[in-house]
């Protein structure tokens, strides 16, 4: 099942997801002066069996002037582009997103690919947030988003993120400077991470952060 | 269970300096960036200040800033609030808090008069 | 003069559904931010009742319900009863005061 919406945005924060459901699917954009090739593939599709997943399809670009060839193109990773959901220097990778059962990696970059990525994100998605350059989280620990099903209709939680501005007090000399974490509820030290609620799910890529919103107080 | 255990309050002399303790338990109090609010008698709640989980950025309302000053200690989970130069309008219940915030604690009295 | 303006009073007779407004401004609810809502009964410490614009924490009746559209947020408490009787709080981040602002509160009477 498809999810409705973006994940949600916050303010001086981008997210990203480490690993991609079976499921997802990916425009097959291009950049200005770009266009996808004859019977080429709108869209690529995470697809897999219980022991291996990969992305179906393959997107290639062809230039807009150029009508009657057609390149078959190879991922360039050098030509890496800046997007919306990757490019995050996050300290917490959560586990190998290889190791993640039902799950497939970022595809490779294609030639000639736009600078965005448009993902189309499916239930049990999960994103991750960090503060932007310049901006600083609150909290330590992680900001996560998760695709839930509810009463038929899909939504993402709200990651509890505060990314803060300029600093009023200088950093110390050698203090380490505090990565992306939630403006979140404290967790009590006495909850028990396998309890899933409505708002927290989860899985072998959370269980190996600190997990530190949605607490069993609120249960 | 989560508790935030505010201290140091009373009547003091205007000019005069208070400092606050809050002491917390029941959670990861070093995950955390933690508030200072204010409710003067009858009135709404005023934010004051507000530290980051590890200490390393605070900032504060104009009407303490230069004035107050937030600290923490992560190894006794204790946040602190030293107030100088006080005055008759920083009369309030003091309440330290938690998160978004959500955990409050269950304030101390600050009464600047002469 | 508070940043998030509430009106200071409201009332309703029990049974009724009551809603309680928060108006920001573009850094605060206008810029993303989430708005949370409080209760505060008398003579007690603030208690949190809607985090995340309409999200409840566990304990609390899903009578009461919030919402968010553009620089405004509402609190809506339906089936009203007289254990209601507080002042509520609308809070936000403000990205120009680097700190949460508070709606000045409302009032609310049961009637």
């Known amino acids: 099942e498809l999810c409705d919406d973006d994940p949600p945005e916050i303010p001086h924060a981008t997210f990203k997801a480490m690993a991609y459901k079976e499921g997802t699917m990916l425009n097959c954009e291009c950049k200005r002066g770009f266009r996808r090739i004859k019977s080429g593939s709108l869209y690529m599709l995470c697809t897999g069996n219980s022991s291996h997943s990969s992305w179906d399809n393959q997107c290639q670009c062809t230039s807009s002037a150029t009508r009657n060839t057609t390149k078959q193109v190879t991922p360039q990773p050098e030509e890496q582009k800046e997007r919306k959901t990757t490019e995050m220097q996050s300290p917490m990778q959560p586990v190998d997103q290889a190791s993640l059962p039902g799950h497939c990696r970022e595809p490779p970059p294609w030639e000639n690919e736009a600078t965005e990525r448009i993902y189309h994100f499916v239930v049990g998605q999960m994103v991750y947030y960090q503060c932007v350059q310049g901006y600083r989280a609150l909290h330590r620990g992680p900001a996560e988003s998760v695709c839930k099903m509810t009463h038929g209709k899909t939504r993402w939680t709200q990651p509890q993120l505060i990314c803060t501005g300029e600093m009023e007090t200088s950093q110390f000399p050698g203090e380490e400077k505090p990565q992306a974490s939630p403006e979140g509820r404290p967790e009590s030290e006495t909850s028990c991470l396998v309890t899933t609620t409505d708002f927290q799910i989860q899985t072998e890529m959370a269980a190996t952060m600190e997990t530190s919103i949605f607490t069993t107080e609120y249960q | 269970e989560v508790q935030l255990l505010e201290s140091g309050g009373g009547l003091v002399q205007p000019g005069g300096s208070l400092r606050l303790s809050c002491a917390a338990s029941g959670f990861t109090f070093s995950s955390y960036g933690m508030h200072w609010v204010r409710q003067a008698p009858g009135k709404g709640l005023e934010w004051v200040s507000v530290i980051s989980y590890d200490g390393s950025y605070k900032y504060y309302a104009d009407s303490v800033k230069g004035r107050f000053t937030i600290s923490r200690d992560n190894s006794k989970n204790t946040l602190y609030l030293q107030m100088n130069s006080l005055r008759a309008e920083d009369t309030a219940v003091y309440y330290c808090?938690?998160?978004?915030?959500?955990?409050w604690g269950q304030g101390t009295l600050v009464t600047v008069s002469s | 003069q508070s940043v998030l303006t509430q009106p200071p009073s409201a009332s309703g007779t029990p049974g009724q559904r009551v809603t309680i407004s928060c108006t920001g401004s573009s850094s605060n609810i206008g810029a993303g931010y989430d708005v949370h809502w409080y209760q505060q009964l008398p003579g007690t410490a603030p208690k949190l009742l809607i985090y995340s614009n309409n999200e409840r924490p566990s304990g609390v009746p899903d009578r009461f319900s919030g919402s968010k559209s553009g620089t405004s947020a509402s609190l809506a408490i339906s089936g009203l009863r007289s254990e209601d009787e507080a002042d509520y709080y609308c809070?936000?981040?403000?990205?120009?005061?680097?700190?949460?602002?508070f709606g000045g509160g409302t009032k609310l009477t049961v009637l």
């Open positions: 809070a936000a981040w403000d990205h120009s005061l680097n700190g949460p602002v």
């Open positions: 808090a938690a998160g978004v915030p959500d955990y």
